[in-house]
Protein backbone atom coordinates (compact mmCIF):
# COMPACT_ATOMS: atom_id res chain seq x y z
CA UNK A 1 0.00 0.00 0.00
CA UNK A 2 2.73 2.81 0.84
CA UNK A 3 4.56 1.67 -2.27
CA UNK A 4 1.57 2.57 -4.43
CA UNK A 5 1.07 5.70 -2.30
CA UNK A 6 4.69 6.90 -3.03
CA UNK A 7 4.27 6.23 -6.61
CA UNK A 8 0.77 7.75 -6.75
CA UNK A 9 2.16 10.61 -5.19
CA UNK A 10 5.54 11.04 -6.66
CA UNK A 11 3.20 11.00 -10.26
CA UNK A 12 1.05 13.59 -9.16
CA UNK A 13 4.01 15.71 -7.49
CA UNK A 14 6.08 15.52 -11.05
CA UNK A 15 2.82 16.23 -13.10
CA UNK A 16 2.28 19.50 -11.01
CA UNK A 17 5.96 20.25 -11.31
CA UNK A 18 6.53 19.68 -15.18
CA UNK A 19 2.82 21.63 -15.85
CA UNK A 20 4.68 24.52 -13.52
CA UNK A 21 7.79 24.25 -15.88
CA UNK A 22 5.79 24.40 -19.04
CA UNK A 23 3.83 27.91 -17.63
CA UNK A 24 7.12 29.12 -16.62
CA UNK A 25 8.68 28.48 -19.96
CA UNK A 26 5.65 30.03 -21.50
CA UNK A 27 5.65 32.96 -19.44
CA UNK A 28 6.28 36.89 -20.16
CA UNK A 29 7.81 37.57 -16.71
CA UNK A 30 11.23 36.32 -16.39
CA UNK A 31 12.60 39.74 -15.78
CA UNK A 32 10.16 42.66 -14.63
CA UNK A 33 11.24 45.86 -14.68
CA UNK A 34 12.69 47.41 -11.17
CA UNK A 35 10.39 49.86 -10.10
CA UNK A 36 12.31 50.76 -6.37
CA UNK A 37 13.63 53.85 -7.55
CA UNK A 38 9.56 54.19 -9.09
CA UNK A 39 6.82 52.43 -7.94
CA UNK A 40 4.50 54.69 -10.48
CA UNK A 41 5.73 53.94 -14.67
CA UNK A 42 3.98 55.35 -17.65
CA UNK A 43 5.76 51.96 -19.46
CA UNK A 44 5.87 48.90 -17.26
CA UNK A 45 8.73 46.74 -19.14
CA UNK A 46 8.78 42.65 -18.87
CA UNK A 47 10.38 40.13 -20.87
CA UNK A 48 10.80 36.38 -21.36
CA UNK A 49 11.84 33.89 -23.03
CA UNK A 50 9.98 34.19 -26.60
CA UNK A 51 9.43 37.56 -26.47
CA UNK A 52 9.36 41.05 -24.35
CA UNK A 53 6.40 43.30 -23.55
CA UNK A 54 5.53 46.94 -22.23
CA UNK A 55 2.18 47.51 -20.34
CA UNK A 56 1.41 50.88 -20.99
CA UNK A 57 -0.27 53.11 -18.32
CA UNK A 58 -2.80 53.51 -20.66
CA UNK A 59 -4.00 50.08 -19.82
CA UNK A 60 -2.59 48.95 -23.38
CA UNK A 61 0.11 45.41 -23.39
CA UNK A 62 1.99 45.42 -26.19
CA UNK A 63 4.47 42.37 -26.89
CA UNK A 64 7.34 41.50 -29.56
CA UNK A 65 8.89 38.10 -30.25
CA UNK A 66 12.48 37.67 -30.45
CA UNK A 67 12.19 37.24 -34.37
CA UNK A 68 15.82 36.53 -34.33
CA UNK A 69 17.98 33.63 -33.39
CA UNK A 70 20.98 34.05 -33.74
CA UNK A 71 21.23 37.91 -32.80
CA UNK A 72 20.12 36.76 -29.01
CA UNK A 73 22.21 36.25 -26.40
CA UNK A 74 23.93 32.77 -26.02
CA UNK A 75 22.82 32.09 -22.70
CA UNK A 76 19.38 32.84 -22.80
CA UNK A 77 19.49 30.46 -25.63
CA UNK A 78 20.99 28.02 -23.40
CA UNK A 79 18.15 28.72 -20.69
CA UNK A 80 15.88 28.03 -23.64
CA UNK A 81 17.59 24.68 -24.65
CA UNK A 82 17.47 23.99 -20.50
CA UNK A 83 13.76 24.29 -20.30
CA UNK A 84 12.47 22.60 -23.21
CA UNK A 85 14.57 19.34 -22.72
CA UNK A 86 13.14 19.69 -19.15
CA UNK A 87 9.96 19.67 -20.37
CA UNK A 88 10.59 16.87 -23.20
CA UNK A 89 11.88 14.74 -20.30
CA UNK A 90 9.03 15.58 -17.73
CA UNK A 91 6.57 14.73 -20.81
CA UNK A 92 8.59 11.63 -21.56
CA UNK A 93 8.59 10.34 -17.69
CA UNK A 94 4.95 10.88 -17.70
CA UNK A 95 3.89 8.79 -20.90
CA UNK A 96 6.28 6.24 -18.86
CA UNK A 97 5.08 6.26 -15.49
CA UNK A 98 1.14 6.18 -16.46
CA UNK A 99 1.92 2.30 -17.52
CA UNK A 100 4.22 2.16 -14.39
CA UNK A 101 1.58 2.84 -11.98
CA UNK A 102 0.49 -0.29 -9.75
CA UNK A 103 -3.33 0.63 -9.99
CA UNK A 104 -3.09 0.66 -13.44
CA UNK A 105 -3.17 -2.83 -14.88
CA UNK A 106 -2.19 -3.63 -18.88
CA UNK A 107 -2.13 -6.72 -19.83
CA UNK A 108 -0.24 -9.67 -17.87
CA UNK A 109 2.93 -6.54 -17.20
CA UNK A 110 5.36 -8.35 -14.83
CA UNK A 111 5.81 -6.44 -11.65
CA UNK A 112 9.49 -6.15 -12.80
CA UNK A 113 9.17 -4.43 -15.86
CA UNK A 114 6.62 -1.69 -13.71
CA UNK A 115 9.43 -1.53 -11.60
CA UNK A 116 12.00 -0.77 -14.06
CA UNK A 117 9.68 1.88 -15.73
CA UNK A 118 9.10 3.07 -12.05
CA UNK A 119 12.79 3.83 -11.80
CA UNK A 120 12.97 4.75 -15.55
CA UNK A 121 10.40 7.93 -15.22
CA UNK A 122 11.54 8.80 -11.70
CA UNK A 123 15.20 9.45 -13.16
CA UNK A 124 13.47 11.41 -15.92
CA UNK A 125 11.63 13.71 -13.75
CA UNK A 126 14.59 14.13 -11.63
CA UNK A 127 17.04 15.24 -14.86
CA UNK A 128 13.84 17.50 -15.83
CA UNK A 129 13.78 18.92 -12.46
CA UNK A 130 17.32 19.49 -12.51
CA UNK A 131 17.14 21.08 -16.38
CA UNK A 132 14.44 23.30 -15.12
CA UNK A 133 16.27 24.63 -11.48
CA UNK A 134 19.41 25.06 -13.72
CA UNK A 135 17.76 27.19 -16.45
CA UNK A 136 16.34 29.51 -14.07
CA UNK A 137 19.11 29.80 -11.78
CA UNK A 138 21.06 30.72 -15.09
CA UNK A 139 18.62 33.15 -16.21
CA UNK A 140 18.69 34.74 -12.73
CA UNK A 141 22.53 34.93 -12.33
CA UNK A 142 22.12 36.73 -15.72
CA UNK A 143 20.13 39.33 -14.07
CA UNK A 144 21.86 39.73 -11.31
CA UNK A 145 24.88 40.49 -13.58
CA UNK A 146 22.90 43.23 -15.64
CA UNK A 147 21.33 44.35 -12.63
CA UNK A 148 24.50 45.47 -10.96
CA UNK A 149 26.03 46.55 -14.10
CA UNK A 150 23.33 49.05 -15.28
CA UNK A 151 23.26 50.11 -11.50
CA UNK A 152 27.08 51.10 -12.19
CA UNK A 153 25.95 53.18 -15.54
CA UNK A 154 22.79 54.29 -14.42
CA UNK A 155 23.08 57.28 -16.29
CA UNK A 156 24.97 57.47 -19.20
CA UNK A 157 25.90 61.49 -20.16
CA UNK A 158 24.89 62.04 -23.83
CA UNK A 159 26.52 65.70 -24.71
CA UNK A 160 25.67 66.73 -20.81
CA UNK A 161 22.02 67.69 -21.34
CA UNK A 162 20.51 64.51 -22.43
CA UNK A 163 20.78 61.33 -20.31
CA UNK A 164 19.54 57.81 -21.12
CA UNK A 165 18.49 56.09 -18.10
CA UNK A 166 19.09 52.50 -18.72
CA UNK A 167 16.27 50.50 -17.66
CA UNK A 168 17.07 47.76 -14.52
CA UNK A 169 15.22 44.48 -14.42
CA UNK A 170 14.62 42.03 -11.58
CA UNK A 171 13.19 38.37 -10.87
CA UNK A 172 10.00 37.75 -12.47
CA UNK A 173 6.99 35.78 -11.51
CA UNK A 174 8.52 33.07 -13.90
CA UNK A 175 11.66 32.68 -12.18
CA UNK A 176 9.72 31.23 -8.54
CA UNK A 177 7.34 29.30 -10.72
CA UNK A 178 10.59 27.45 -12.28
CA UNK A 179 12.40 27.16 -9.05
CA UNK A 180 9.51 25.42 -7.04
CA UNK A 181 8.25 23.28 -10.52
CA UNK A 182 11.62 22.21 -10.64
CA UNK A 183 11.75 21.60 -7.06
CA UNK A 184 8.75 19.59 -7.25
CA UNK A 185 9.15 17.57 -9.88
CA UNK A 186 12.74 16.62 -8.71
CA UNK A 187 10.74 15.45 -5.60
CA UNK A 188 8.27 13.42 -7.79
CA UNK A 189 11.51 11.98 -9.22
CA UNK A 190 12.87 11.16 -5.86
CA UNK A 191 9.60 9.70 -4.92
CA UNK A 192 8.83 7.33 -7.86
CA UNK A 193 12.57 6.20 -7.62
CA UNK A 194 11.82 5.10 -3.67
CA UNK A 195 8.66 3.42 -5.21
CA UNK A 196 10.65 1.81 -7.58
CA UNK A 197 13.15 0.13 -4.76
CA UNK A 198 9.45 -1.24 -2.93
CA UNK A 199 7.77 -2.50 -6.45
CA UNK A 200 10.60 -4.87 -6.86
CA UNK A 201 12.55 -5.72 -3.37
CA UNK A 202 15.81 -7.70 -3.24
CA UNK A 203 16.24 -11.58 -2.34
CA UNK A 204 17.49 -10.86 1.12
CA UNK A 205 13.79 -9.41 1.49
CA UNK A 206 11.99 -12.63 2.08
CA UNK A 207 11.72 -14.63 5.00
CA UNK A 208 13.81 -17.66 5.31
CA UNK A 209 11.02 -21.09 6.00
CA UNK A 210 11.60 -24.09 7.25
CA UNK A 211 9.72 -26.82 5.14
CA UNK A 212 9.42 -30.50 6.48
CA UNK A 213 8.50 -33.38 3.92
CA UNK A 214 8.22 -36.41 5.65
CA UNK A 215 10.89 -38.72 6.48
CA UNK A 216 13.71 -36.11 4.76
CA UNK A 217 14.48 -32.80 5.47
CA UNK A 218 14.62 -30.25 3.35
CA UNK A 219 16.60 -26.88 4.42
CA UNK A 220 15.38 -23.32 2.24
CA UNK A 221 17.91 -20.54 2.79
CA UNK A 222 16.58 -17.06 3.47
CA UNK A 223 17.44 -16.59 0.03
CA UNK A 224 13.99 -18.54 -0.97
CA UNK A 225 15.95 -20.98 -3.71
CA UNK A 226 16.34 -24.33 -2.35
CA UNK A 227 20.07 -24.52 -0.99
CA UNK A 228 20.67 -28.73 -0.42
CA UNK A 229 18.13 -31.05 -1.40
CA UNK A 230 19.65 -33.97 1.20
CA UNK A 231 18.64 -36.79 -1.05
CA UNK A 232 15.14 -35.49 -2.11
CA UNK A 233 13.62 -36.24 -4.91
CA UNK A 234 12.43 -33.04 -5.56
CA UNK A 235 15.03 -31.35 -7.86
CA UNK A 236 13.42 -28.23 -8.94
CA UNK A 237 14.12 -24.66 -7.01
CA UNK A 238 11.41 -23.44 -5.57
CA UNK A 239 10.30 -20.00 -4.40
CA UNK A 240 8.69 -20.16 -0.76
CA UNK A 241 6.68 -17.70 0.58
CA UNK A 242 5.98 -17.69 4.66
CA UNK A 243 2.32 -18.00 4.59
CA UNK A 244 1.23 -14.69 6.89
CA UNK A 245 -0.82 -11.95 4.68
CA UNK A 246 0.52 -9.82 2.75
CA UNK A 247 -0.48 -6.65 0.74
CA UNK A 248 -0.65 -6.46 -3.13
CA UNK A 249 2.48 -4.31 -2.27
CA UNK A 250 4.97 -6.56 -0.59
CA UNK A 251 4.20 -9.88 -3.17
CA UNK A 252 6.26 -10.21 -5.57
CA UNK A 253 6.92 -12.75 -8.44
CA UNK A 254 10.26 -12.06 -9.06
CA UNK A 255 13.09 -10.14 -7.75
CA UNK A 256 14.60 -8.25 -10.31
CA UNK A 257 17.75 -6.11 -10.88
CA UNK A 258 17.61 -2.53 -12.23
CA UNK A 259 20.11 -1.57 -14.66
CA UNK A 260 19.65 1.92 -16.08
CA UNK A 261 22.16 2.93 -18.93
CA UNK B 1 -18.61 58.42 -32.29
CA UNK B 2 -16.16 58.84 -28.84
CA UNK B 3 -17.18 62.81 -27.45
CA UNK B 4 -15.88 64.42 -24.34
CA UNK B 5 -17.80 67.15 -23.32
CA UNK B 6 -16.61 69.53 -20.66
CA UNK B 7 -19.05 71.88 -18.15
CA UNK B 8 -18.61 75.54 -18.84
CA UNK B 9 -16.65 78.66 -17.99
CA UNK B 10 -16.02 79.47 -14.15
CA UNK B 11 -15.28 82.66 -12.74
CA UNK B 12 -13.80 82.58 -9.13
CA UNK B 13 -12.34 84.68 -6.39
CA UNK B 14 -8.91 83.94 -5.16
CA UNK B 15 -8.69 81.31 -2.53
CA UNK B 16 -12.07 79.62 -3.57
CA UNK B 17 -12.18 76.22 -5.45
CA UNK B 18 -13.68 75.11 -8.74
CA UNK B 19 -14.99 71.46 -9.81
CA UNK B 20 -14.76 71.02 -13.49
CA UNK B 21 -16.62 68.00 -15.26
CA UNK B 22 -15.82 65.83 -18.51
CA UNK B 23 -18.92 63.77 -19.86
CA UNK B 24 -17.94 61.13 -21.69
CA UNK B 25 -19.89 58.78 -24.47
CA UNK B 26 -19.70 57.06 -27.35
CA UNK B 27 -16.99 54.42 -25.77
CA UNK B 28 -16.83 52.10 -22.53
CA UNK B 29 -15.78 54.89 -19.89
CA UNK B 30 -14.40 52.34 -17.72
CA UNK B 31 -11.93 51.26 -19.64
CA UNK B 32 -9.81 54.39 -20.67
CA UNK B 33 -7.51 56.56 -18.29
CA UNK B 34 -9.26 60.27 -17.85
CA UNK B 35 -6.22 62.69 -18.16
CA UNK B 36 -6.03 66.48 -17.60
CA UNK B 37 -4.17 69.04 -19.08
CA UNK B 38 -3.95 72.48 -18.41
CA UNK B 39 -3.12 75.68 -20.78
CA UNK B 40 -2.83 79.22 -19.68
CA UNK B 41 -3.64 81.81 -21.95
CA UNK B 42 -0.54 82.01 -25.07
CA UNK B 43 1.17 79.15 -23.02
CA UNK B 44 1.97 75.76 -23.69
CA UNK B 45 0.22 72.49 -22.31
CA UNK B 46 0.81 70.93 -18.68
CA UNK B 47 -0.44 67.67 -17.96
CA UNK B 48 -2.24 67.68 -14.66
CA UNK B 49 -3.11 64.23 -14.14
CA UNK B 50 -5.23 61.48 -14.96
CA UNK B 51 -7.69 59.15 -13.42
CA UNK B 52 -9.08 55.47 -13.96
CA UNK B 53 -12.94 55.16 -13.83
CA UNK B 54 -12.97 51.39 -13.10
CA UNK B 55 -11.41 52.03 -9.68
CA UNK B 56 -10.86 55.54 -9.15
CA UNK B 57 -6.65 55.11 -9.31
CA UNK B 58 -4.93 58.34 -10.26
CA UNK B 59 -1.95 59.45 -10.85
CA UNK B 60 -1.08 62.81 -10.37
CA UNK B 61 1.94 65.98 -11.59
CA UNK B 62 3.38 65.89 -7.91
CA UNK B 63 3.19 69.68 -9.47
CA UNK B 64 -0.92 69.80 -8.92
CA UNK B 65 -0.98 67.49 -5.53
CA UNK B 66 -1.94 70.09 -3.37
CA UNK B 67 -3.97 71.57 -6.15
CA UNK B 68 -6.02 69.39 -8.04
CA UNK B 69 -8.13 66.36 -7.34
CA UNK B 70 -9.65 63.80 -9.32
CA UNK B 71 -12.34 61.57 -9.35
CA UNK B 72 -15.47 59.85 -11.57
CA UNK B 73 -18.68 59.08 -11.39
CA UNK B 74 -19.31 55.40 -12.79
CA UNK B 75 -23.14 56.25 -13.11
CA UNK B 76 -22.77 59.19 -15.08
CA UNK B 77 -19.64 58.56 -17.27
CA UNK B 78 -18.27 61.63 -15.72
CA UNK B 79 -14.72 62.82 -14.50
CA UNK B 80 -14.16 65.40 -12.25
CA UNK B 81 -11.50 67.75 -11.22
CA UNK B 82 -11.18 70.16 -8.71
CA UNK B 83 -9.13 72.49 -7.72
CA UNK B 84 -8.80 74.54 -4.76
CA UNK B 85 -7.13 77.66 -3.43
CA UNK B 86 -7.97 79.14 -6.69
CA UNK B 87 -4.79 82.27 -7.55
CA UNK B 88 -4.38 84.07 -10.35
CA UNK B 89 -1.60 81.47 -11.92
CA UNK B 90 -4.58 78.93 -11.90
CA UNK B 91 -6.13 81.44 -14.90
CA UNK B 92 -6.14 78.74 -17.85
CA UNK B 93 -7.98 76.55 -19.79
CA UNK B 94 -8.44 73.12 -18.48
CA UNK B 95 -8.93 69.92 -20.76
CA UNK B 96 -9.88 66.59 -19.88
CA UNK B 97 -8.89 63.93 -22.61
CA UNK B 98 -8.56 60.07 -22.98
CA UNK B 99 -5.61 58.29 -22.92
CA UNK B 100 -4.86 55.98 -26.14
CA UNK B 101 -1.89 53.40 -27.25
CA UNK B 102 1.56 55.09 -26.56
CA UNK B 103 0.23 57.02 -23.36
CA UNK B 104 -1.00 59.42 -26.30
CA UNK B 105 -4.41 61.23 -25.90
CA UNK B 106 -6.80 60.40 -28.48
CA UNK B 107 -9.80 62.63 -27.48
CA UNK B 108 -10.24 65.70 -25.70
CA UNK B 109 -12.72 67.60 -24.30
CA UNK B 110 -13.90 71.20 -25.88
CA UNK B 111 -12.13 72.77 -22.96
CA UNK B 112 -12.98 74.94 -19.82
CA UNK B 113 -11.90 77.94 -19.39
CA UNK B 114 -11.44 79.39 -15.39
CA UNK B 115 -10.80 82.43 -14.76
CA UNK B 116 -9.31 83.73 -11.15
CA UNK B 117 -9.83 87.41 -10.58
CA UNK B 118 -10.70 89.46 -7.49
CA UNK C 1 10.63 64.92 -14.98
CA UNK C 2 11.63 64.84 -19.22
CA UNK C 3 12.37 67.32 -20.45
CA UNK C 4 10.79 68.16 -23.80
CA UNK C 5 12.58 70.70 -25.85
CA UNK C 6 11.03 71.74 -29.41
CA UNK C 7 12.94 74.00 -32.31
CA UNK C 8 12.36 76.34 -33.93
CA UNK C 9 9.98 78.43 -31.89
CA UNK C 10 8.01 79.16 -35.27
CA UNK C 11 8.63 78.40 -38.28
CA UNK C 12 7.09 80.03 -41.53
CA UNK C 13 7.05 78.24 -45.26
CA UNK C 14 5.46 78.39 -48.38
CA UNK C 15 1.94 76.69 -49.47
CA UNK C 16 3.49 73.53 -50.57
CA UNK C 17 6.54 73.68 -49.23
CA UNK C 18 7.87 70.73 -46.71
CA UNK C 19 8.36 71.52 -43.12
CA UNK C 20 10.09 70.46 -40.18
CA UNK C 21 10.22 70.36 -36.49
CA UNK C 22 12.23 69.09 -34.19
CA UNK C 23 11.68 67.57 -30.56
CA UNK C 24 14.49 66.81 -28.55
CA UNK C 25 14.44 65.02 -24.71
CA UNK C 26 15.94 64.79 -21.79
CA UNK C 27 15.90 61.47 -21.66
CA UNK C 28 15.26 58.07 -23.51
CA UNK C 29 11.75 57.79 -24.42
CA UNK C 30 12.49 54.07 -26.11
CA UNK C 31 10.91 50.89 -23.95
CA UNK C 32 13.50 48.36 -24.32
CA UNK C 33 10.07 46.32 -23.99
CA UNK C 34 8.65 46.53 -27.57
CA UNK C 35 11.49 48.95 -28.50
CA UNK C 36 8.57 51.77 -29.56
CA UNK C 37 9.64 55.14 -28.63
CA UNK C 38 6.65 57.02 -26.34
CA UNK C 39 6.67 60.33 -28.35
CA UNK C 40 3.41 61.86 -29.09
CA UNK C 41 2.54 64.83 -31.71
CA UNK C 42 -0.16 67.33 -31.51
CA UNK C 43 -1.75 69.91 -34.00
CA UNK C 44 -3.36 72.66 -32.09
CA UNK C 45 -5.41 75.21 -33.92
CA UNK C 46 -6.71 78.81 -32.42
CA UNK C 47 -9.50 78.38 -29.88
CA UNK C 48 -9.55 74.36 -30.44
CA UNK C 49 -8.21 71.47 -28.09
CA UNK C 50 -5.34 69.22 -29.32
CA UNK C 51 -5.78 67.09 -31.88
CA UNK C 52 -3.72 63.62 -32.09
CA UNK C 53 -1.02 63.59 -35.07
CA UNK C 54 1.19 60.63 -34.38
CA UNK C 55 1.81 58.43 -31.12
CA UNK C 56 4.73 55.93 -30.65
CA UNK C 57 7.01 58.41 -32.43
CA UNK C 58 6.03 57.21 -36.13
CA UNK C 59 2.25 56.25 -36.06
CA UNK C 60 -0.17 58.46 -37.54
CA UNK C 61 -3.52 58.46 -35.40
CA UNK C 62 -6.75 57.10 -37.78
CA UNK C 63 -7.81 60.20 -40.37
CA UNK C 64 -4.25 62.04 -40.51
CA UNK C 65 -2.95 63.17 -44.01
CA UNK C 66 -0.11 61.06 -44.58
CA UNK C 67 1.58 64.06 -45.25
CA UNK C 68 2.68 64.29 -41.64
CA UNK C 69 5.25 61.77 -40.69
CA UNK C 70 6.59 61.15 -37.43
CA UNK C 71 10.47 60.30 -37.40
CA UNK C 72 13.39 59.74 -34.81
CA UNK C 73 14.30 57.57 -31.68
CA UNK C 74 15.63 57.53 -28.70
CA UNK C 75 15.40 61.18 -27.74
CA UNK C 76 15.95 63.08 -31.32
CA UNK C 77 12.55 63.10 -33.14
CA UNK C 78 11.00 65.07 -36.17
CA UNK C 79 7.68 66.16 -37.33
CA UNK C 80 7.72 66.54 -41.14
CA UNK C 81 4.91 68.01 -43.36
CA UNK C 82 6.03 66.94 -46.92
CA UNK C 83 3.53 69.27 -48.48
CA UNK C 84 2.17 72.49 -46.31
CA UNK C 85 -1.23 73.33 -46.53
CA UNK C 86 -3.31 76.37 -45.84
CA UNK C 87 -5.31 73.76 -42.91
CA UNK C 88 -1.45 72.93 -41.43
CA UNK C 89 -0.79 76.28 -39.67
CA UNK C 90 -1.34 76.01 -36.18
CA UNK C 91 0.95 75.25 -33.14
CA UNK C 92 2.83 71.54 -32.80
CA UNK C 93 3.39 70.37 -29.35
CA UNK C 94 5.42 67.05 -28.98
CA UNK C 95 4.41 64.85 -25.45
CA UNK C 96 6.28 62.36 -23.62
CA UNK C 97 4.69 59.61 -23.16
CA UNK C 98 7.58 57.09 -21.27
CA UNK C 99 7.38 58.49 -17.87
CA UNK C 100 5.58 60.48 -15.06
CA UNK C 101 4.84 63.01 -15.58
CA UNK C 102 3.68 63.47 -18.97
CA UNK C 103 5.22 66.49 -20.61
CA UNK C 104 5.18 68.87 -23.76
CA UNK C 105 7.36 70.45 -25.32
CA UNK C 106 6.85 74.78 -25.58
CA UNK C 107 5.23 74.08 -29.05
CA UNK C 108 6.18 75.29 -32.95
CA UNK C 109 4.06 77.58 -34.24
CA UNK C 110 3.32 76.99 -37.59
CA UNK C 111 2.50 79.73 -40.16
CA UNK C 112 2.53 80.72 -44.29
CA UNK C 113 4.67 82.94 -45.88
Known amino acids: MAVTACQGLGFVVSLIGIAGIIAATCMDQWSTQDLYNNPVTAVFNYQGLWRSCVRESSGFTECRGYFTLLGLPAMLQAVRALMIVGIVLGAIGLLVSIFALKCIRIGSMEDSAKANMTLTSGIMFIVSGLCAIAGVSVFANMLVTNFWMSTANMYTGMGGMVQTVQTRYTFGAALFVGWVAGGLTLIGGVMMCIACRGLAPEETNYKAVSYHASGHSVAYKPGGFKASTGFGSNTKNKKIYDGGARTEDEVQSYPSKHDYV | QVQLVQSGAEVKKPGASVKVSCKAS????????VNWVRQAPGQGLEWIGMVHPSGSETRLNQQFKDKATLTVDKSTSTAYMELSSLRSEDTAVYYC???????????WGQGTLVTVSS | DIVMTQSPDSLAVSLGERATINCLSS????????????LTWYQQKPGQPPKLLIYWASTRDSGVPDRFTGSGSGVDFTLTISSVQAEDVAVYYCQNGFSFPFTFGQGTKLEIK
Open chain 3, 27 to 38: QSLLASGNQRNY
Open chain 2, 26 to 33: GYSFTNYW
Open chain 2, 97 to 107: ARVWSGNAFDY
